[in-house]
């Protein structure tokens, strides 16, 4: 912490301006009034403060607003946002998308994924739900940030907003997030025709159950391998060779080059070698011909 000293009269600060870059840390601490700083936050970003000086300014604001900054200050943080920790941000209440845009721009190119995730979370809480305007802002200013939200927060997305989500916005989503988003997407796109539906639902399929994947295999969709490999393991394992062949169409050929990766590897191990041979890929590791498959999990469930 910066030690407290008295401000020399000639150094007294009446407005936030360029002259402050010549102040030492202890002079900034002694001479800058926190309320003045908060009132003139919009000027701070135009002044080339050092990171050390920004630390002092942050300390000032922290003292003035121990319960968290008001949005009027947050909106104008500029590069001071780079000094914020997730713990700081958790105290904020943010409702304005202009504030979100401003801070997302500042964070670009910096390693701030935890801070950005917390900020987005605060915006969703502040606005009450993940509405279309918020989704549009995220996709425009922070591709992939949608996936930084918890499944709980994502559950507040109305199905009507799903159409605004682009495939690249879901690249970093995990299975638990796609589990939440998939049923909403299914609902949002339910009135579309077969091929159009598949193109739209494709990025969300990591959350699809086996029965939906089986249904897709009957529709000539030609699922690409990257999409297939993002399907839930539990959704892939029950599929037959014939179903996978129908599902992937021409892309089934790619199983050979991805046979060491899950879920392809796990699926191969559950198929009869005879059936795998029909794919014309030289895939090995299936259940040898003449072997009997016992599903012990069924017996355990009955006892």
């Amino acid at each position: 912490d910066v030690e407290r000293t008295t401000c020399p009269p000639e150094k007294e600060v009446h407005e936030i301006d360029e002259s402050l870059i010549f102040y030492k840390k202890r002079e900034l601490e002694a001479c800058v009034d926190a309320a003045l700083l908060a009132a003139q936050m919009d000027r701070v970003d135009a002044i080339p403060f050092t990171y050390e000086q920004l630390d002092v300014l942050k300390h000032k604001l922290d003292e003035l607003y121990p319960q968290g900054y008001p949005e009027s200050v947050i909106r104008h943080l500029g590069h001071l946002f780079l000094k914020m920790s997730p713990e700081d941000i958790r105290k904020w209440n943010v409702t304005s998308l202009e504030t979100l845009k401003a801070l997302l721009k500042v964070s670009k190119g910096h390693e701030m994924s935890a801070q950005v995730a917390t900020l987005i979370d605060r915006v969703v809480v502040g606005r009450g739900q993940l509405d279309k305007d918020t989704v549009d802002t995220l996709t425009a200013f922070c591709p992939g940030c949608l996936c930084s939200l918890s499944p709980e927060r994502l559950s507040s997305v109305p199905p009507s907003v799903i159409g605004a989500v682009r495939p690249q916005d879901l690249d970093t989503c995990g299975p638990r997030q796609l589990d939440v988003l998939y049923p909403k997407a299914r609902l949002a796109f339910q009135n579309m025709s077969g091929s159009e539906y598949f193109v739209k639902i494709r990025p969300f399929l990591g959350g699809a159950p086996t029965e939906d994947v089986k249904a897709l295999s009957q529709q000539n969709v030609s699922m690409d391998l990257a999409t297939f490999m993002k399907l839930r393991r539990e959704a892939v394992l029950p599929l037959t060779v014939a179903e996978v062949q129908k599902l992937l169409g021409p892309h089934v050929e790619g199983l050979k080059v991805e046979e060491q990766h899950s879920p392809v590897r796990d699926w191969i191990l559950k198929q009869r070698q005879d059936d795998l041979d029909t794919l014309g890929l030289g895939l090995q590791g299936g259940i040898p011909n003449g072997y009997l498959i016992l599903d012990l999990s069924v017996r355990e469930a009955l006892s």
């Epitope: 495939p167 690249q168 690249d171 030609s222 690409d224 391998l225 990257a226 490999m229 993002k230 062949q245 169409g249 021409p250 892309h251 089934v252 050929e253 790619g254 050979k256 080059v257 991805e258 990766h261 899950s262 041979d277 029909t278 794919l279 014309g280 890929l281 030289g282």
Partner: antibody, heavy 117, light 113 residues
Framework: EVQLVQSGAEVKKPGASVKVSCKAS????????MHWVRQAPGQGLEWMGN????????YYNERFMSRVTMTVDKSTSTVYMELSSLRSEDTAVYYC??????????WGQGTLVTVSS | DIVMTQSPDSLAVSLGERATINCKSS????????????LAWYQQKPGQSPKLLIY???TRESGVPDRFSGSGSGTDFTLTISSLQAEDVAVYYC?????????FGGGTKVEIK
């Protein structure tokens, strides 16, 4: 050594059909898919489709869907590509290419098909 | 369809110098599970069939000289010939095998300056 030997050059009239063959040797024929790619004179490469030699299942580029048929004869390790309703813009060198997984690892020498009235 | 855009269209390089060819796809070619990029590079010498050089964006096909290297991920890829030899005069094509119809770039003609 993997070899793909294609049938000879053909001259066809507009509206006719052409059937190009590709005889494979030097590997287990049913373990690798075959693709067909064409190249118009002085132009780039265009993927036409692929076929599973084990089952005979074939898949086509939608651009050729109604006009192309790919077949296989396992007894002679040969794949065929037939293109119907030929027009002058189908004049091209047609290549068969054996898959290396997804990419095209081995190519035939090409078959020039000329469509002219 | 995925559109593949190659640049430049042609390239004249002195013997022993570096040649760089770029290829851009209209959507990602990265399989985020396996981290494989579904992109291949081919060389076609005058009057010959194409020949595979690189697959998975950066894996050199066996028998291909190590002066050929591929790099890039997602949508932006590069083929580099570190020291151009006379026998490298050819047209070079990138191809995506991420989603059918598999599409090729327009080709880049490499010549000796």
């Amino acid at each position: 050594e993997v070899q793909l030997v294609q049938s000879g050059a053909e001259v066809k009239k507009p509206g006719a059909s052409v059937k190009v063959s590709c005889k494979a040797s030097g590997y287990t024929f049913t373990n690798y898919w075959m693709h067909w790619v064409r190249q118009a004179p002085g132009q780039g490469l265009e993927w036409m489709g692929n076929i599973n030699p084990s089952s005979g299942d074939s898949y086509y580029n939608e651009r050729f869907m109604s006009r192309v048929t790919m077949t296989v004869d396992k007894s002679t390790s040969t794949v065929y590509m037939e293109l119907s309703s030929l027009r002058s813009e189908d004049t091209a060198v047609y290549y068969c290419a054996r898959s290396g997984g997804l990419w095209l690892a081995f190519w035939g020498q090409g078959t020039l098909v000329t469509v002219s009235s | 369809d995925i559109v593949m855009t190659q640049s430049p269209d042609s390239l004249a390089v002195s013997l022993g110098e570096r040649a760089t060819i770029n290829c851009k796809s209209s959507q990602t070619l990265l399989n985020s599970v396996s981290q494989n990029n579904y992109l291949a590079w081919y060389q076609q010498k005058p009057g010959q069939s194409p020949k595979l050089l690189i697959y998975f964006a950066s894996t050199r096909e066996s028998g291909v000289p190590d002066r050929f290297s591929g790099s890039g991920s997602g949508t932006d890829f590069t083929l580099t010939i570190s020291s151009l030899q006379a026998e490298d005069v050819a047209v070079y094509y990138c191809q995506q095998h991420y989603r059918t119809p598999y599409t090729f770039g327009g080709g880049t003609k490499v010549e000796i300056k």
